[in-house]
């Protein structure tokens, strides 16, 4: 660290004068010792141009002076009639040799600015790279090449062929020649920032024989794309930042006055306000990615920007894309519950709205997962197999024409808590986010099935009963057989319905289902549930195992429910067992060609749609009571 101090960079124009003041520590020795100004050569030698001892070089003759001001502990070098040949690296210093105390000074002398007609205009976006083309004649092939930027009348060197780079262009500017070209050099300036805009001059050679080119650089702020979205709908920000940032961390941020607050990035950062309703998806290897936000709120409106930087945070000089999001409060998307509560062992029925004009669209339900950029694997869909771990407890009930479908999840555990998305392969705006909160149960469930260990014997009659409380008296009770493509409602018998509507005996409200005779294919999950019209309520599930009759063993009805079924003469015993056409279908990957964040849970493809829908017993070869 030198005790001598002065200007690190001095810039001026041809014909002007400069006065360079160098400051030294206030000591008696320093006040009286030799002061000098020398020019740094490529060989490391600093050739004296002027000193306080009275030395004056030829090139400074008649146009330079060095004056010591000991009272101020300064000395001043005045240089007049500047030419571009004065551009270079210098030292101002103290001592008997030029190796003593010194300070490095860079002097840049530029051409008198004129805005010439041959100015080439370069227009680039912030963060991008510009390549300025500089032509020169053969006579300057071996001469110094440089690019300077006009600042007022001065032109400050950005870069030159002596490897000088202005500090503000450090690691951003390179000067190069292509191939065997002898008449052109190029300057690349990367990570463009607004202050880079302006007039540049590139030069080959010195003095009157120098070749010069003018370049006007315009650095554009990203023009925000306007997005108009409905309240509760979803928005996708498609971000294409170019191959040069393909390997850098990506982010989406929301502008807040001078800053841009990161909402999500590929390094795992996520704003809690977007928890459960945001996904960031890489699109390809060229730096493209998208950010999907569902369940738009009024407060989501604003300026958004996507970008890339190794820190995952906004940085000046890195490419960005911008949007302005408007959220329309007069939404066509109905207001549905954003939080659904359930208890362990119980069930929830989630109503998912969709565009009523697209009743034939495929419906899906996925579970939002927070890991990394967020993902939403499909759990169930109208053509998707129920994901492993959800067999027997998850079904999607489509209600064509109603503008909604219902997803029922039963046998709840606290691990089911989290965010879920309703979506279709149609209008992508109709994506809704639901937060499921599962608490520990504090009382018995409303629906109870007996027997709880249900094992039916092939060829025999098997009845299973579902007990419901009086609060469900007026609701429709149903039994359905669960399969991978839904839960198909079966005929059943409601014993409580025969009672007077005035009184309700809590103990005798039963809806029963009978399999007669039991077949092997009757094995599986059965649900007992309640509904009002198309509004589904509580459900409970039971797995019915089917086994061969042991030889010689008498048939014993294992439950009271079965005994009660025999005593009911008006009940018809159906002669055939329930059948299921297990249509297995896969979520077509083409549905989400643009939205790979929704991951397919299915593993088998089928060309035709699954035929059985909840609400009908179509496809059944039997029924139940």
């Amino acid at each position: 660290q030198s005790p001598i101090f002065g200007p690190q960079d001095v810039s001026s124009i041809e014909g002007n004068s400069v006065s360079i003041t160098c400051y030294y520590p206030d000591t008696s020795v320093n006040r009286h010792t030799r002061k000098y100004w020398c020019r740094q050569g490529a060989n490391g030698y600093c050739a004296t141009l002027i000193s306080s001892n009275g030395y004056l070089s030829k090139e400074y003759s008649g146009r330079a002076s060095l004056i010591n001001f000991p009272e101020n502990s300064t000395f001043v070098i005045n240089i007049a009639h500047l030419t571009q040949e004065d551009t270079g690296s210098y030292k101002c210093g103290l001592g008997t040799t030029n190796r003593g105390l010194f300070f490095d000074v860079s002097l840049e002398v530029s051409q008198v600015p004129e805005f010439p007609n041959d100015t080439h205009v370069y227009t680039k976006d912030i963060g991008r790279t510009v390549t300025i083309e500089c032509r020169f004649k053969e006579g300057n092939a071996h001469s110094k090449k440089s690019l300077c930027k006009k600042r007022g009348e001065a032109c400050e060197v950005v870069i030159d062929s002596t490897e000088y780079v202005d500090p503000s262009y450090k690691d951003r500017a390179i000067l190069f020649m292509k191939g065997t070209s002898r008449d052109i050099f190029y300057v690349n300036i990367s990570h463009l920032i607004p202050s880079d805009a302006g007039l540049y001059v590139c030069q080959a050679g010195e003095g009157p024989s120098a070749d010069k080119n003018n370049a006007d650089l315009q650095v554009l702020e990203p023009e925000p794309e306007l997005l108009y979205k409905d309240l509760r709908s979803s928005v996708t920000f498609e971000c294409d930042l170019g191959r040069e940032v393909a390997n850098d961390a990506k982010y989406l941020c929301r502008k807040n006055k001078e800053t841009c607050d990161v909402i999500i990035n590929t390094l795992g950062k996520r704003d809690p306000a977007f928890e459960g309703r945001i996904l960031l998806t890489p699109r390809d290897d060229n730096g493209r990615f998208s950010v999907l936000i569902t369940g738009l709120r009024k407060e989501d409106a604003g300026h958004y920007q996507c970008g890339a930087h190794s820190s995952g945070l906004p940085q000046e000089g890195w490419p960005v894309q911008a949007w302005q999001l408007f959220v329309n409060e007069e939404s066509t998307i109905p207001n549905s519950r954003s939080v659904v509560k359930g208890v362990t062992g119980g069930s929830v029925a989630i109503v998912c709205p969709y565009n009523p004009k697209e009743s034939s669209s495929l419906k899906y339900w996925c579970h939002w997962e927070a890991d990394e950029n967020g993902r939403c694997p499909v759990l169930v869909g109208t053509q998707a197999l129920v994901q492993e771990g959800y067999e027997g407890r998850l079904a999607l009930f489509d209600q064509p024409g109603s503008g909604a479908y219902t997803v029922i999840l039963n046998q709840l555990t606290t691990q089911d808590s989290g965010f879920y998305w309703c979506l279709t392969d149609g209008d992508s705006r109709w994506r809704t986010t639901i937060e499921l909160q599962v608490a520990e149960a504090t009382k018995k469930p409303d629906l109870e099935v007996t027997p709880q260990n249900a094992t039916a014997v092939i060829g025999e009659t098997f009845t299973i009963s579902c007990h419901y409380p009086c609060k469900f008296y007026s609701q429709e009770k149903y039994w359905c057989k669960w399969s991978n493509d839904g839960c198909h409602i079966l005929p059943s018998h409601d014993e409580g319905a025969r009672q007077s509507s005035v009184s309700c005996d809590q103990s005798s409200q039963i809806v029963s289902m009978t399999l007669n005779p039991v077949k092997k294919e009757d094995e599986g999950w059965y649900w007992c549930g309640v509904k009002e019209g198309q509004v589904y309520g509580e459900t409970t599930a039971i797995y019915v195992a089917v086994e061969e009759r042991t030889r010689g063993s008498p048939h014993i009805n294992p439950t009271d429910a079965n005994a009660r079924a025999k005593d009911a003469p008006e009940e018809e015993a159906m002669e055939s067992s329930v059948r299921e056409d297990e249509n297995k279908a896969n979520l077509d990957p083409r549905l989400f060609a643009d939205e790979r964040e929704i991951q397919n849970a299915g593993d088998q493809a089928q060309e035709n749609r699954a035929s059985g829908n909840a609400g009908s017993a179509g496809g059944q070869s039997g029924s139940s009571k």
């Epitope: 101090f5 200007p7 960079d9 001095v10 400069v18 003041t21 400051y23 300064t74 001065a154």
Partner: nanobody, 126 residues
Framework: EVQLVESGGGLVQSGGSLRLSCAAS????????VGWFRQAPGKEREFVTA??????????YYADSVKGRFTISRDNARNTVDLQMNSLKPEDSAVYYC?????????????????WGQGTLVTVSS
């Protein structure tokens, strides 16, 4: 009397960048020196960088601790002096002050500036 107003301070992560601006009102920056100083809690105010100009000649000064990382520039159109701070370190955290002086001969590192701004806080987190 020149009124100086700093802007652009804020919280930034280590290695990040920030751009401070010093705007002059009352007169244009002409034949003038504008310096940036900083003061960290419990420490003395220290010189960071300065820019001095006379007509079409410009002189730039930098403290050793910021050389190669900070760049001072003048924006004639906006009548501002900007400080571009790159590769920020936690030790760069401080209140940054912009100061203006008329004398061409004063040491830009000194405290004999005619006018001072209110300061803008820069916090660099590790």
């Amino acid at each position: 009397e020149v009124q100086l107003v700093e802007s652009g301070g804020g919280l930034v992560q280590s290695g990040g960048s920030l751009r401070l601006s010093c705007a002059a009102s009352g007169r244009t920056f002409d034949q003038f020196t504008v310096g940036w100083f900083r003061q960290a809690p419990g420490k003395e105010r220290e010189f960071v960088t300065a820019i001095r100009w006379s007509g079409s000649t410009t002189y730039r000064y930098y403290a050793d601790s910021v050389k190669g990382r900070f760049t001072i520039s003048r924006d004639n159109a906006r009548n501002t002096v900007d400080l571009q701070m790159n590769s920020l370190k936690p030790e760069d955290s401080a209140v940054y002050y912009c100061a203006g002086q008329m004398s061409q001969w004063s040491d830009p590192r000194g405290d004999d500036y005619d006018s001072w701004g209110q300061g803008t806080l820069v916090t660099v987190s590790s």
